[in-house]
């Protein structure tokens, strides 16, 4: 390769000048040796230009020079008055033209702006504001003001100090004239529209004393940010437009391959029905700013989105927005994990949530997607135990099984359950993510008495029925808190062989407190784990009673009573906000429901497995 | 100060494309010249791309020697962004790319020397 290195690509505008330096190694032959800068023809030969020897060609008389400075390797190649011929290959080098050390440049000149002398800049986003300075003198003081636009070899009249106002700016422009003294008005235009763009003139006065000052108006679009994100995770877009919107209605949309914009979300409630159960709009802070959720990314979410404000809730021109591309990234970290989970009446779930697994300390939180409105998604567990009241006895979020993975579970399912779930943690905010609770037909798999009452100082058996299904399974029960379910210590009685030749149509594991005590009281699990996945899982409440009678009591299926009257509890609502989506503890207080007691421990409690035969009772 | 954040780096496949941002906070470029570095693990830094522009529309674009047209560097309109357009990526082009500013005038755009300000990398991989 050449030693010698350049710019490749110089791009210009007619009438400017450009200065192009080549550098090379200063070898003291390197030094003092021929430089050059010639033009590649179609025959490939490079016809010198100008060296630094003193050549100059005909075309490049007057207008172009080279310059060494052999003290740094360098040499420069300055090029006036460019024309859109000048556009070309070239190549900067030493030496002999024809021989290898040299660099090929490519000019390229393009018809430039043509603004008249004195010309202001004005160079802004759509939808922002623009205040164009017009200064004039002390005799113009009294007279008209105006700005008009440049369109071609006319000029518009936009707006002037007798109130008039071309209707392609109303409500939306203002012309100021200061106090005495300051020899300058100012027009203000709002909502700036792509269609602004171009050359303004501001005039104070008339005739041959009138002052004149040209403004070059620049309306760009904006740059759209690169986001990338991974499959199955979540994307997150604030949006802050100003102060002027904060109280107009905001929204997404998607540019879509006419170039509209589809709504995604807005705050009047429109909700694009593609991102239903996975999208949430945060309120907006005081300053207008917002932001938007957007869990569970597929592939077919990229693109590019813009935020804005607008009364219609959708793309206006001249209103601000932001941009954002999206690119969704296959390889993504984010395990695959069922977006649809599918329990029945009665029964249960347990839902595997990811979340990064450097981040094993953070909190992790469950929540449920309401589509009211903007969305919200209230907590309804966390791992520090706090739980919506109304899911006491019947809600819990398991650490396991840890890295990268926890789990929760809901049961006594009702068709109210159906819906959309967030699983999130107080760390990594992409790892968000989202799953659908579907309630089908069909029967729970494990059988438990509807309501238990049991009486104090006495024996307690309850029966977990099981189908052969889950024979290899592990089977627990454990005590319900709302720091979790305390597995409850298993005993072992007689031969594995009873779940081995599963020919039955149930099998069963019974829990034995004994003797009953007051802190007893509360919800207990039947469940079937495997490892640390676990499966299905059916509560039963106990409630704690004085004896009446001597004796034990054993509740057998036939004695089963309906589910327990749920208790109803008020209970404050906490939603997942911008700033609570980071720190949980921001969230509104509410009612902790209180722990249910001492875990039952020790040899007080049993879980006994064995065939329902054993236990005198079956259940079809 | 000026801060530089790079952005757009992640995981593709060999013959894939990535466009990497490099957005400027605390000012302006008004030092009105960028450059894109690479390192990769246990080499030198690279020199990848540089773009330097004059404030009446002249820019000059400079790439080193491995780019051969795959990669185009380019500024934003907002003019605090500079991208690195990265196109028909080989595995030989994982590394770290960072992007560097200058105070003010800039000697030879290659040398890590002339440059003052760096962002603190975004991470390409490439598979094959």
């Known amino acids: 390769k050449s030693p010698v290195f350049g710019p490749q690509e110089v791009s210009s505008v007619e009438g400017n000048s450009v200065s192009i330096k080549c550098y090379y190694p200063p070898t003291s032959v390197n030094r003092h040796t021929r430089k050059y800068w010639c033009r590649k023809g179609a025959s490939g030969r490079c016809i010198t230009l100008v060296s630094s020897e003193g050549y100059v060609s005909s075309n490049y008389a007057g207008r172009a020079n080279l310059t060494n400075f052999p003290e740094n390797g360098t040499f420069v190649v300055n090029i006036a008055q460019l024309s859109r011929d000048d556009s070309g290959h070239y190549k900067c080098g030493l030496g002999i033209n024809s021989r290898g050390l040299s660099f090929d440049v490519s000019l390229e000149v393009s018809q430039g702006p043509e603004l008249p002398n004195g010309t202001e800049v004005y160079t802004v986003d759509v939808g922002r504001t623009v205040t164009i300075k017009c200064p004039f003198k002390t005799e113009n003081a009294p007279k008209t003001k105006a700005l008009y636009k440049k369109i071609g070899q006319t000029s518009v009249l936009v707006i002037d100090s007798r109130n008039y106002v071309n209707p392609n700016y109303k409500d939306r422009i203002r012309l100021r004239i200061p106090g005495t003294g300051q020899l300058i008005f100012t027009v203000v235009i709002d909502r700036l529209r792509l269609s602004d763009h171009g050359l303004y003139l501001c005039q104070a006065g008339d005739g041959s004393n009138r002052d004149e000052k040209n403004a070059d108006l620049q309306v760009l679009e904006p740059e759209p940010e690169l986001v990338y994100e991974d499959l199955r995770g979540s994307v997150t877009f604030h949006c802050a437009l100003g102060l002027e919107v904060a109280n107009v209605a905001k929204f997404l949309c998607r540019v879509n391959s006419r170039e509209t914009c589809d709504v995604v979300i807005n705050t009047l409630g429109k909700r694009d029905s593609a991102f239903e159960g996975r999208i949430l709009l945060n309120p907006q802070d005081k300053d207008g700013s917002f932001s938007v959720v957007i869990t569970g990314l597929r592939k077919e979410d990229e693109g590019r989105y813009l935020c804005g404000a607008h009364s219609d809730g959708q793309l206006q021109e001249g209103w601000p927005i932001q941009a954002w591309q999206l690119f969704v990234n296959e390889e993504s970290t984010i395990p695959r994990s069922p977006t649809v989970v599918k329990g029945v009446a009665g029964g249960s779930v347990a839902v595997l949530c990811p979340y990064n697994p450097k981040e094993s300390q953070s909190l992790k939180y469950w929540c449920l997607w309401e589509g009211a409105q903007n969305g919200r998604c209230p907590l309804l567990v966390e791992s520090q135990g706090l739980v919506q009241e109304q899911y006491e006895g019947r809600l819990s979020l398991l650490q396991e099984p840890g890295n990268g993975t926890f789990t929760v579970i809901l049961n006594q399912l009702t068709t109210q359950d159906a819906g959309f779930y967030w699983c999130l943690t107080n760390g990594d905010t992409r790892w968000r993510t989202t799953v659908e609770i579907k309630i089908i037909e069909g029967e729970p798999n494990l059988k438990v008495p509807g309501n238990v009452t049991a009486v104090l100082g006495e024996t307690l058996n309850i029966p977990c029925h099981f189908p052969c299904k889950f024979s290899s399974y592990e089977k627990y029960w454990c005590k319900w808190s709302n720091t979790g379910c305390q597995t409850l210590p298993s005993q072992d009685e007689g031969p594995s062989e009873a779940f081995v030749n599963c020919d039955e149509n149930s099998r069963l594991v019974s829990l034995t407190l004994n003797p009953v005590t007051r802190a007893d009281e509360g919800w207990y699990w039947c469940g079937v784990k495997q490892g640390h996945f676990y499966g299905e899982t059916a509560a039963v409440y106990v409630a704690v009673e004085e004896k009446k009678v001597a004796g034990s009591r054993y509740v057998s299926p036939a004695k089963a009573d309906a589910a327990p009257d749920e208790k109803v509890l008020d209970s404050g609502v906490r939603e997942i906000e911008n700033k609570a989506i980071q720190d949980p503890r921001l969230f509104a207080e509410e009612k902790v429901v209180a722990d249910t007691g001492d875990q039952a421990g020790g040899s007080r409690a049993s879980v006994d497995s064995s065939s329902s035969e054993e236990q005198g009772g079956s259940s079809k | 100060e000026v801060q530089l954040v790079e952005s757009g780096g992640g995981l593709v496949q060999a013959g894939g494309s990535l466009r990497l941002s490099c957005a400027a906070s605390g000012r302006t470029f008004s030092s009105d010249a960028v450059g894109w570095f690479r390192q990769a693990p246990g080499k030198e830094r690279e020199f990848v791309a540089h773009?330097?522009?004059?404030?009446?529309?002249?820019?000059?674009?400079y790439y080193g020697d491995f780019v051969k047209g795959r990669f185009t560097i380019s500024r934003g309109t907002a003019k605090n962004t500079v991208y690195l357009q990265m196109n028909s990526l080989k595995p030989e082009d994982t590394a770290v790319y960072y992007c560097?500013?200058?105070?003010?005038?800039?000697?030879?755009?290659?040398?890590?020397?002339?440059?003052?300000?760096w962002g603190q990398g975004t991470l390409v991989t490439v598979s094959s």
């Open positions: 773009i330097h522009w004059s404030g009446d529309f002249t820019t000059y674009y």
């Open positions: 560097a500013a200058p105070k003010g005038a800039i000697g030879d755009p290659r040398s890590t020397r002339e440059y003052d300000y």
